[in-house]
């Protein structure tokens, strides 16, 4: 695994190849989570920000920006959209939290939490899944779409395996993040795909 | 098979500093965080820090970032860690502890270092 | 940080027996506890890593459980090479802490 501190995975064009996949050996289904990545793009249509699949599920679990202003999470294939006012286009820090028992979904940009939404109350995330960065996944792993890949500049990517109280959140955004137990940008298991390049941070 | 190898014994005189070695074999040193962690006897066992051979990114416990220093030599795939002012309360084992691949646990640890700090 | 309290200093028991290491952390700290095992004149080594998975090698008669802020190290049929001190540790916040050991004499 790579120590990627200080480093991004630059998306340098629109494809339906170039990505990264995410190795982790997560063998439980999660019933919480914790996801927090920088990412900075100019691109004004749809995009995937973090796809995770599991073997016959599509939409498992992803974080999708569905224009400027609009930021999505799928789990188990329903979704819900929470809004903010955001600059564009400008760097972004994202951290998004599931939690099974509720059902409640929270979106932190910048540090700062949108409102609360509800869904799949008492699912869990299937376990053992491909994780791709760049591409929205229609299989396991695969069938990309063009129109849904990320251009631009992602980062500083953690995944826990609980809803982070506040002030965690708040350190993963000014840069002091909590050990993470799924996804570690500081301990990252990748394969890069295509034309991904990594760069060192300059937008934070 | 994976082995880090520490010497067994540094005596040293209060005041002076001691630069600890932990050379790794066996796996790939630049692809894994080395830990340092302390044991006295009958205090349990304190973690000083940690460094990512490949990047040199550290990260201390706050208790000992005055007190430790964390270096790697990639050449020889060996993990340093200086000691300074030593006093009584240093004297200690000292252990390097390898990071598993994807857990912050440690899979592999060194066969440790006792420190006897005395005049 | 966070305190790592294993309550029992030592703990006695007999080959064959079942005997549970406790450890309280002082705040929560999730599944991201590991267990380790030393015996006298070595090194520590993994036993339980995430509350509950063996580590590789690992006898199938050690077995971790808990999550949150209780954790337990359990050892079934008790063998004499059990002889030891387990140290839990918490792996959810910097810095990392273990907790001050609880050493199994073999009766």
């Known amino acids: 695994h790579t120590d990627l501190s200080g480093k991004v995975f630059v998306f340098p064009r629109e494809s339906v190849t170039d990505h990264v996949n995410l190795i982790t050996p997560l063998e439980k289904p999660l019933q919480n989570f914790t996801l927090c990545f920088r990412a900075y793009s100019d691109l004004s249509r749809a995009y995937s920000l973090f796809s995770y699949n599991t073997q016959g599920r599509d939409n498992e679990l992803l974080v999708y920006k569905e224009r400027v202003g609009e930021y999505s999470l799928y789990i188990g294939r329903h979704k819900v959209t929470s809004k903010v006012i955001e600059k564009f286009p400008a760097p972004v820090h994202i951290c998004v939290s599931w939690e099974s028992s509720s059902g409640i979904a929270e979106f932190w940009i910048n540090g700062t939490p949108l409102v609360k939404k509800g869904l799949r109350q008492g699912y869990f995330v299937e376990a053992q899944p491909k994780i791709v960065l760049g591409q929205e996944q229609d299989s396991y792993g695969g069938k990309f779409d063009r129109s849904q890949s990320f251009v631009g500049e992602i980062g500083d990517l953690y995944m826990w395996d609980s809803v982070l109280p506040p002030e965690n959140i708040l350190s993963a955004y000014q840069g002091t993040p909590l050990p993470a137990n799924i996804l570690d940008w500081q301990a990252l298991n990748y394969e890069i795909r295509g034309y991904v390049i990594i760069k060192p941070l300059v937008w934070v | 098979q994976v082995q880090l190898q520490q010497p067994g014994a540094e005596l040293i005189k209060p005041g002076a500093s001691v630069k600890l070695s932990c050379k790794a074999s066996g796996y790939t040193f630049t692809s894994y965080w080395m830990h340092w962690v302390k044991q006295r006897p009958g205090q349990g066992l304190e973690w000083i820090g940690m460094?990512?051979?490949?990047?040199?990114?550290?990260n201390y416990n706050e208790k000992f970032k005055s007190k430790a220093t964390l270096t790697v030599d990639k050449s020889s795939s060996t993990a340093y860690m200086q000691l300074n002012s030593l006093t009584s309360e240093d004297s200690a084992v000292y252990y390097c502890a390898r990071r598993n691949d994807y857990y912050w646990y440690f899979d592999v640890w060194g066969t440790g270092t006792l420190v006897t700090v005395s005049s | 940080d966070i305190v790592m309290t294993q309550s029992q200093k030592f703990m006695s028991t007999s080959v064959g027996d079942r005997v549970s290491v406790t450890c309280k952390a002082s705040?929560?700290?999730?599944?991201?506890v590991a267990w380790y095992q030393q015996k006298p004149g070595q090194s520590p080594k993994a036993l339980i890593y995430?509350?509950?998975y063996r580590y590789s090698g690992v006898p199938d008669r050690f077995t971790g459980s808990g999550s949150g802020t209780d954790f337990t190290l359990t050892i079934t049929n008790v063998q004499s090479e059990d002889l030891a001190e387990y140290f839990c540790?918490?792996?959810?916040?910097?810095?990392?802490?273990f907790g001050s050991g609880t050493k199994l004499e073999i009766k």
């Open positions: 995430s509350a509950s």
């Open positions: 540790q918490q792996c959810n916040n910097y810095p990392f802490t």
């Open positions: 705040q929560n700290v999730n599944s991201n």
């Open positions: 460094i990512h051979p490949n990047s040199v990114n550290t």
